[in-house]
């Protein structure tokens, strides 16, 4: 029978399928930075090249007993999860091991950097097919380790990292916090977050998705035919590295941005019980469990988007938060969220040639998040139109005036500190299709895009009665690109996208105050890409 | 994800008042010193000196050599363990923490990070 973890990540129609590149050979290479490994193990024999790379600190303690089988345990298991003959995700994939962790599983940032540089050198000396780097390790936040991951990712290498086993915010650890790596948390057979005693999987906005990481059967270094079970975010990351290897085997030209978007889009959604995570992290943590996506040939030119949360701005009066998309992605909309509801809105601005999503805290606020909607839009040409705040009592309108440009998102930013003088801005789909409409003292920003066959429409849903949140979803075949909260109560916490669902959050106290006439409305902009059609606004 | 998380950044940017050397005296350090927020994971005595993005190969070597020379002048021996050329410009050095102020004032230095542990997950 198939182990639970493989059954979970590989849909039935993929089970027997062999992934091969178009010319028939599987050219993907996975580099594993970990402990030493037992290359003669039956699971991985003939698939593994043990490089001569070794950069590890000395083991702790005076009584340390060095046994090869114990030194090799972690790395051998992970090599088996990636490409093992029986229990591997990407059974035919060739793997190169670099030793950056000692027999106790400890390494250094510097040793890891030298390992990453070794991979870059190998790439320069002998260019090959797609490279996947598996980093089943974590240390404290390191600017240089994150920077090295960024540099390597920009050369076309796909890096997959463990989120960490500290039951903590993954953003506090490296390489998990590097935006250019695919960061993986761990779930168990019940699709719940992995608990490891008092500790467990890391979580938060720096995690891209989760994968099986509890009681994973894989190669044991105790003997060449032994198997054992291990748990952790390393095992989860190894599953995703295997999935990525299979995706690249079929389609070697997939980029990091495409791989990440497809992993997110085709993952299993909403099965994780978010109550396991700290309350303030629940909204930031993706409820996604990895599965092997179908090939792009099977799924056509779907519009793929993901939500990227900024770091928390902090509570100072002028604190701003910034969310960025990956270089290949288009920022189609920007919204903001504050737990206290005290925020001065959000906007899109260009920094160093890249559009970024900004949010501003308000006086007395505990801080804000900027929430970017980052999408893959082939051959897109996007721009921002903004209108400064109108005089009191007047509406501000912004629409996409360029030919064939469609509205993909609206942002609103209030000049005034006093939250009571302003009403929330509004999007109007019926009266003024494709316009962003702002009220008193709001600057309005419209995100307008032109791309072959891109069409968009607004979908609204309002609730008059008491409700902590209002949601509106884009229907099948459409992708959520923009999400806003409209007039309603005087105090809304903001809006954000969860997969294809637009969530507008309302302050608890506001719920009680509200009269039935003041509906809170969640407004979604839903788009789709139909390559044969012209760009259009759908009413 | 790219914001610095729970992370220690220490400004050791002091105006240089060293030995009257023209290039040194003129250079005020704007580089920062960073280290892991979890003290137990720190490796004091080993530092990654990260240079500005556009630093050329020869300049990396010169900067490392300059640090050795200036340290020796103060009676310190430092060991350059590795030079990074391919992923980022910089070098790994074993030295006393007393020399951090000096190292931060070197031309081309963007920041210095104390080495720290990573762990199998």
């Amino acid at each position: 029978s198939i182990p639970w973890n493989l059954e979970r990540i590989i849909p039935a129609w993929h089970q027997t399928e062999e992934d091969r590149s178009p010319d028939g050979s599987s050219q993907v290479e996975v580099y594993l930075l970990d402990t030493s490994i037992q290359g003669a193990h039956r699971e991985i024999e003939g698939r593994v090249t043990i490089t001569d790379f070794n950069s590890v600190p000395e083991e702790d303690g005076t009584r340390f007993h060095r046994q090869a089988s114990k030194c090799d345990s972690h790395g051998t298991h992970l090599a088996g999860v990636v490409s093992g003959r029986d229990a591997g995700v990407a059974k035919g994939t060739s793997l190169h091991s670099l030793r950056v962790l000692n027999c106790q599983g400890k390494g250094t940032v510097s040793g890891t950097l030298i390992g990453l540089e070794f991979i870059r050198k190998s790439q320069l000396i002998q260019p090959s097919g797609p490279l996947v780097v598996l980093l089943p390790l974590a240390g404290g936040y390191s600017r240089i380790l994150n920077a090295a991951c960024r540099h390597l990712a920009r050369t076309g290498v796909v890096l997959v990292a463990a989120a960490g086993n500290f039951r903590d915010d993954a953003c506090l650890y490296s390489p998990a916090s590097a935006p250019e790596v695919i960061t993986v948390g761990a779930t168990n057979a019940q699709d719940q977050p992995v608990t490891l005693g008092t500790l467990g999987t890391n979580f938060g906005r720096c995690v891209d998705l989760f994968a099986p990481g509890k009681d994973i059967i894989g190669a044991s270094s105790d003997c060449s035919t032994c198997f054992m079970s291990q748990s952790g975010t390393s095992q989860a990351a190894a599953h995703v590295a295997g999935i990525v290897a299979r995706m690249l085997s079929r389609e070697p030209t997939l980029t990091l941005a495409e791989l990440r978007q497809r992993l997110i889009h085709f993952s299993t959604k909403d099965v994780i019980n978010m109550a396991w995570f700290p309350e303030d992290q629940q909204v930031l943590t993706p409820n996604l469990v990895a599965t092997l996506p179908p090939s792009t040939h099977e799924t056509g030119g779907q519009l793929l988007c993901r939500t990227v949360w900024s770091a928390h701005s902090g509570p100072t009066r002028t604190a701003t938060a910034t969310a960025r998309c990956a270089p290949e992605e288009e920022l189609l909309s920007c919204s903001s969220f504050s737990r206290s509801g005290r925020r001065r809105g959000d906007w899109i601005e260009a920094i160093g040639g890249q559009q970024v999503c900004k949010a501003l805290n308000a006086f007395g606020g505990e801080g804000v998040y900027a929430v970017a909607r980052c999408c893959l839009v082939p051959r897109a040409n996007c721009s921002i139109h903004n209108t400064p705040a109108a005089r009191a009592g007047l509406e501000t309108h912004v629409h996409c005036h360029q030919k064939d440009h469609v509205l993909t998102g609206c942002s609103f930013h209030w000049e005034v500190e006093d939250l009571s003088v302003r009403r929330q801005p509004a999007l109007r789909s019926r009266r003024q299709p494709g316009q962003c409409v702002g009220h008193q003292a709001a600057s309005v920003y419209a995100s307008c895009c032109h791309a072959p066959g891109l069409e968009c429409k607004i979908k609204e849903h309002g609730i008059s009665g008491p409700s902590e949140q209002v949601t509106v979803a884009c229907e099948a075949g459409w992708t959520l690109t923009g999400c806003n909260v409209l007039p309603g109560a005087s105090l809304t916490l903001g809006a954000y996208s969860v997969d294809n669902l637009c969530v507008a959050r309302v302050h608890d106290t506001a719920r009680a105050d509200r009269t039935s006439g003041e509906a809170t409305v969640a407004a979604a902009i839903c788009c789709r890409s139909r390559p044969s059609a012209k760009a259009s606004w759908v009413q | 994800q790219d914001e610095d998380g729970d992370y220690e950044e220490l400004m050791l940017a002091l105006p240089s008042q060293e030995d009257g050397l023209a290039d040194e005296a003129a250079h005020v350090a704007t580089a920062t010193f960073r280290r892991c927020s979890k003290e137990a994971w720190r490796l004091p005595g080993t530092y990654i000196v990260v240079l500005m993005e556009e630093t050329q190969r020869l300049q990396i070597e010169q900067t490392a050599h300059r640090l050795q020379t200036r340290a020796a002048r103060r009676g310190y021996v430092i060991k350059v363990l590795h030079i990074f050329y391919d992923l980022f410009p910089g070098f790994l050095v074993k030295m006393s923490s007393d020399l951090l102020g000096l190292a931060l004032k070197l031309p081309h230095v963007e920041y210095i990070e104390e080495d720290s542990f990573v762990f199998a997950q």
Epitope: G61, T62, R63, K70, Q104, G197 | E39, A120
Partner: antibody
Framework: QVHLVESGGGVVQPGRSLRLSCAAS????????MHWVRQAPGKGLEWVAL????????YYADSVKGRFTISRDNSKNTLYLQMNSLRAEDTAVYYC???????????????WGQGTTVTVSS | QSVLTQPPSVSAAPGQKVTISCSGS????????VSWYQQLPGTAPKLLIY???KRPSGIPDRFSGSKSGTSATLGITGLQTGDEADYYC???????????FGTGTRVTVL
Amino acid sequence: QVHLVESGGGVVQPGRSLRLSCAASGFTFNSFGMHWVRQAPGKGLEWVALIWSDGSDEYYADSVKGRFTISRDNSKNTLYLQMNSLRAEDTAVYYCARAIAALYYYYGMDVWGQGTTVTVSS
Amino acid sequence: QSVLTQPPSVSAAPGQKVTISCSGSSSNIGNNFVSWYQQLPGTAPKLLIYDYNKRPSGIPDRFSGSKSGTSATLGITGLQTGDEADYYCGTWDSSLSAYVFGTGTRVTVL
């Protein structure tokens, strides 16, 4: 349910030996470091020894170094403390405790047994 | 004798706040993770705080930890009679290669 149950305590004469056991259940024993901690009557906690998850390394308090040996049998989910050359000052309740994690042993202990009493007296 | 020093006792009325200090050196508290343990009379110790300020699940947020330099502090707010116990700090000592506990503090609810 996570459980640690100590056994093997008793009254022993100075200079003699005793072996304590700690049976673990409800968790993956081979994924965690394990400690022994003792508490003399009316006194505070005193750490005794630590063993890594795979048994590859051990640490001891100076007061027991050379006399006590910590070991484990991962196939039996059991931790041991072999106590030789016992002294009157070794009289205490001995607790076994699970390290918070395998690698970061300095994090402390998150699960404790109920303890077994060792009395060293002539 | 212990290398971590705690006050022998602290007391306060129900609902009040108490703090317990734990003083060490750079080789222990200064450079390692601090945990706090509660030992109710006649029972085994129980983990309250680890990694200076993190609470295991099931520990109420009335208990908090902090660290400054070579000292750590445990705070208990909204004191309850059930909080009467001995409290110990603990950490690894790098120079001893050993785990060390504090001297212990008895908390009395008046």
